[in-house]
Every structure is written in C-alpha cells, then in structure tokens.
Amino acid sequence: MNGRVDYLVTEEEINLTRGPSGLGFNIVGGTDQQYVSNDSGIYVSRIKENGAAALDGRLQEGDKILSVNGQDLKNLLHQDAVDLFRNAGYAVSLRVQHRLQVQNGPIGHRGEGDPSGIPIFMVLVPVFALTMVAAWAFMRYRQQL
C-alpha cells in the first residue's frame, strides 16, 4: 500500500555573518534551473562544514530561501540569485522556508496529525484514566498508613 507524506511548512528569519568562505552553503534552483517541479524557487543544496551557516545551525539542506536582505528571490535566473548572495554584504538576513516531514504511513490507516496512525484521543484517554486510578489508589493507601 502506498504511503502518504505530509509536510509541516514553517518560515524563519536567519541572520548570518559572512565568514572567510562566504555564507557557507550552495544553492540550486531558478527559472532556468528548476530544482523542484513547477517551482523556480531557490533551495539550499549543501551546507558546508564549518561554514557560517553550519556554525549557526538553523539553515538546513532542502530549505527554500524566500528572500535575501528583503530582496524577493521569486522568478530569478540561477546566476542572478548566486550574485545576490555573493554581493549581499557582511551581515545577511535570510527569510527561509523549512519543510518538515511529519507523516509517512499507509493511506486509510491514519489519524490526522498523529504519526502512528492511531487517533490521539485513543492514546490519551486510557493513559489519563490509568493515571487517575493510580493516583486514587496511592492516596487511599497513604491514608491507611
């Protein structure tokens, strides 16, 4: 049976200080070099070891970069984007879109929002009941001492 992959998309502002080897990551994408089907956006292809991005720790391979110092990266040729990064200065502000994989399991055997496929209330209700029983038993036992 085929699995379904869902993503949690979050955005973050990342401020990097250019290091001796630049910003420390490579990019792919652009209108002339689509990395993702039907998406000409700019993506992080590689984080360089001990580079500025790696030392900061927030930027991840596969992240989509939405803007550089407020300059939108939509509909840019690849080299235009490269040159924007190259000339962005010492302190660089990146608007980044992270995509986190949150689900991966068989279709039809899933609870929305729960990676195990079991609805969350079916786990929480018995756990809560068991906790209450244990607490009640403990209180009774303590009163008898």
Epitope: D32, L76, L77, H78, D83, L84, N87
Partner: nanobody, 124 residues
C-alpha cells in the same frame, strides 16, 4: 551558464555608422557596459547603462556620437555609433555587472563580472 554575444562589428568608412548588439543569457537586470581595446592599448570604457535603462554614462571621447540603449524584453544591449573616426578602431566588448540590480553604474572594469568575446570595428 552566462553568455554575452556581441554582433554588428565590421569595416566602415570614416564618418559612417554602426550598431553593435549584445545578446545576454544566463543573467538579467544587470547594469551593462561597452568597452573597447585597440591594438597595443589597454581596454577602455566606452559607455554604460543601468539595469532599468534610465541612466547612462559615456567616456568624453564618444559623447554626442555614441548612444547606449537596451531592450530588457530581449535581454539585449545596443551601442549606436555615428560619425566614426579611425581612432574608434578596436575590438568592442560587451560586459555585465557582477551585481543583480545594482544601484550605481560606472566605468570601472572591476564592476563587470561577465564579458563577451568581442566584435571587431575597423574605421578606414
């Protein structure tokens, strides 16, 4: 891959005209410049135009005889040269600024990251 391809050069008599073209691919919205290099001389600035086309600058020796223009829809830059003189004989190079949508234009070779192969202009 960035490419700048010049065309339109040739042999022309003194007082004649030429229109050079530079077709750009791989980059867009760049300040563009034309430079020239005569045999045994340094490469020198001729003219530049801003990425939007609203600002131009020329070297004194060509002012009034040369016009730089651009068509962003075609990603092409032009150099219209009139009243040509023998001293205009040179290889003419098209160049693109290394910065995307850069603010200022200028004659400095250092601003220009991408270069064409050149087109020969000979004025007899």
């Amino acid at each position: 891959q960035v490419q700048l391809v010049e065309s339109g050069g040739g042999l022309v008599q003194a007082g004649g005209s030429l229109r050079l073209s530079c077709a750009v691919s791989g980059v867009s919205f760049r300040n563009m410049g034309w430079f020239r290099q005569a045999p045994g001389k340094e490469r020198e600035f001729v003219a530049a135009i801003s990425w939007s086309g609203d600002s131009t600058v020329y070297v004194d020796s060509v002012k009034g005889r040369v016009t730089i223009s651009r068509d962003n829809a075609k990603n092409t830059v032009y150099l219209e040269m009139n009243s040509l003189k023998p001293e205009d004989t040179a290889v003419y190079y098209c160049a693109a600024d290394g910065r995307f949508r850069a603010g200022q234009i200028g004659p400095s070779l250092g601003l220009y990251h991408y270069w064409g192969q050149g087109t020969q202009v000979t004025v007899s």
